[in-house]
Interface confidence: low
């Protein structure tokens, strides 16, 4: 997890939640400035700083970094996926390194619902679902924290390579599962390698590539109910000649173009005044 990707993750430390490439962010509500000489306020501020330091050190430890890199907004924008929702998130937060806005504090026993945007980056699949090292993409990891939230929206984002002329592209998403026994045509029997969960016809006209979003809420619900069923997915987008236009290589050369999952979740948090 070292190198530019780690640097980007570290730069997004304030927005990090969970592990395995999953990142979340929420716009922090603004609060009125505390009056001077307020002991509780001083304690809150100190407590907040301690928590932040703890979170930062956990993230840095996970990323195997000694210290947070000094990284600008522009660098972050270059390193994170070059996709519409992430650009919007960065703009929304006016991302400035690890700068944080104050948290809100609520009255005792008040229930407070907040929405978060969670980004889960594609990772390599488990060898159990691979045949001769394929498919390597894509597995999406979700932390228990996220799995216990209510999913309001879930979208898979896939980058399609540019086409020289307008073309009809057929995108399919296959749910992976480990190979068992002998496979059969049509996917029957114990050897069913993957099950198509989405197919989509897309008219491509772009000479500059295209970010395609696919509704994934239903699949996410099923994964969250049965996490053991999440072995990942395979993504293909074939043009009429059989060329796969979906960028699914997780290696170098496709930085910022990897598939990722965008979740909008509702977190019911019960907080009490300390």
């Amino acid at each position: 997890a070292e190198g530019p990707a780690a640097a980007a993750a570290a730069a997004a430390a304030a927005a990090a939640a969970g592990v395995g490439g999953e990142r979340s962010s929420r716009p922090a509500p603004s609060v009125a400035p505390e009056p001077d000489g307020c002991p509780v306020c001083v304690w809150r501020q100190h407590s907040r700083e301690l928590r932040l330091e703890s979170i930062k050190s956990q993230i840095l430890s996970k990323l195997r970094l000694k210290e947070a890199p000094n990284i600008s907004r522009e660098v972050v924008k270059q390193l994170l996926p070059k996709a519409p929702p992430l650009q919007q998130i960065l703009d929304l937060h006016d991302f400035q390194g690890d700068a944080l806005q104050p948290e809100d504090f609520l009255e005792e026993d008040e229930y407070h619902a907040t929405t978060e945007t969670v980004i889960s980056m594609a990772q390599e699949t488990d060898p159990a679902v691979q045949t001769d090292g394929s498919p390597l993409c894509c597995h999406f990891h979700f932390s228990p924290k996220v799995m216990f939230t209510k999913v309001l929206k879930a979208q898979l984002w896939v980058y399609l390579r540019p086409v020289p002329r307008p073309a009809t592209v057929y995108l399919q998403i296959l749910r992976l599962k480990p190979l068992t026994g002998e496979g059969t045509a049509g996917g029957g029997g114990g050897g069913r390698r993957h099950i198509r969960i989405r197919s989509l016809k897309i008219e491509l006209h772009s000479r500059s590539g295209h970010w395609q979003s696919i509704d994934f809420k239903q699949v996410l619900h099923s994964w969250f109910r049965q996490p053991q069923s999440n072995w990942g997915i395979e993504i293909n987008a074939f043009d009429p000649s059989g060329t796969d236009l979906a960028v699914t290589s997780l290696g170098p050369g496709a930085e910022g173009l990897h598939p990722f999952m965008e979740l909008r979740v509702l977190e019911n948090t019960k907080r009490s005044r300390r």
Epitope: Y170, G183, A185, G187, G188, R192, R193, R196, S241, G242
Partner: antibody
């Protein structure tokens, strides 16, 4: 334009053999699973066999298992069906068909189809 | 294997009329169903895949619906070139199987 041109049909005696060919053009043949489907005179369609894009996997209908062999030569963009121990009930028009999706032969429909070739098994 | 049953076997209609063809699976195939059109002496042609998606170049008068075990192909207003045999095919389970066909003929 995607095209499948078939050849090799004819009249053959029961117990004998015949090989059908299907020449593909207009698409990356080596990326697609390919199928054979047959239609007895005046009857409906019956799926016969499928081969994966790289020739590593073949699957057959129970009615032809052990007698028919599907194969492909990706260097020649050609699909084959070797039919041995032919029976009268094998009499049909045989169609080759391109799997709609690239890759493995699973959950598929067919598009396009070859023009068909008639195989008549009669003594 | 999954048995596909089409009804009616023959449908006698006039040009301009609406045609409703039915296909039933012996067990659920989710939405893994395709429809084909076949004219005499010709190979089948794909019309609909995944139960409701029109294939490229297929006119909007053709539409598919259904999920699980019951499926319908509707031709909103029959054109002279639509008189043909129509087959459904499931690809939810091996082996891939076809219905017996519905012959849409001119009344």
């Amino acid at each position: 334009q995607v095209q499948l041109v078939q050849s090799g049909g004819g009249v053959v005696q029961p117990g004998r053999s015949l090989r059908l060919s299907c020449a593909a053009s207009g698409f990356t043949f080596s990326s697609y699973a390919m199928h054979w489907v047959r239609q007895a005179p005046g009857k409906g369609l019956e799926w016969v066999a499928v081969i994966s894009y790289d020739g590593s996997n073949e699957y057959y209908a129970d009615s032809v298992k052990g007698r028919f062999t599907i194969s492909r030569d990706n260097s020649k963009n050609t699909l084959y069906l070797q039919m041995n121990s032919l029976r009268a009930e094998d009499t049909a028009v045989y169609y080759c068909a391109k799997d709609f999706w690239s890759g493995y032969p699973q959950y598929n429909w067919f598009d396009p189809w070859g023009q068909g070739t008639l195989v008549t098994v009669s003594s | 294997e999954i048995v596909m049953t089409q009804s009616p076997a023959t449908l006698s209609l006039s040009a301009g009329e609406r045609a409703t063809l039915s296909c039933r699976a012996s067990q659920s195939v989710s939405n893994y169903l395709a429809w084909y059109q076949q004219k005499p002496g010709q190979a089948p042609r794909l019309l609909i895949y995944d139960a409701s998606n029109r294939a490229t170049g297929i006119p909007a008068r053709f539409s598919g619906s259904g999920s699980g075990t019951d499926f319908t192909l509707t031709i909103s207003s029959l054109e002279p070139e639509d008189f043909a045999v129509y087959y459904c095919q499931q690809y939810g389970s091996a082996p891939l199987t076809f219905g017996g066909g519905t012959n849409v003929e001119i009344k």
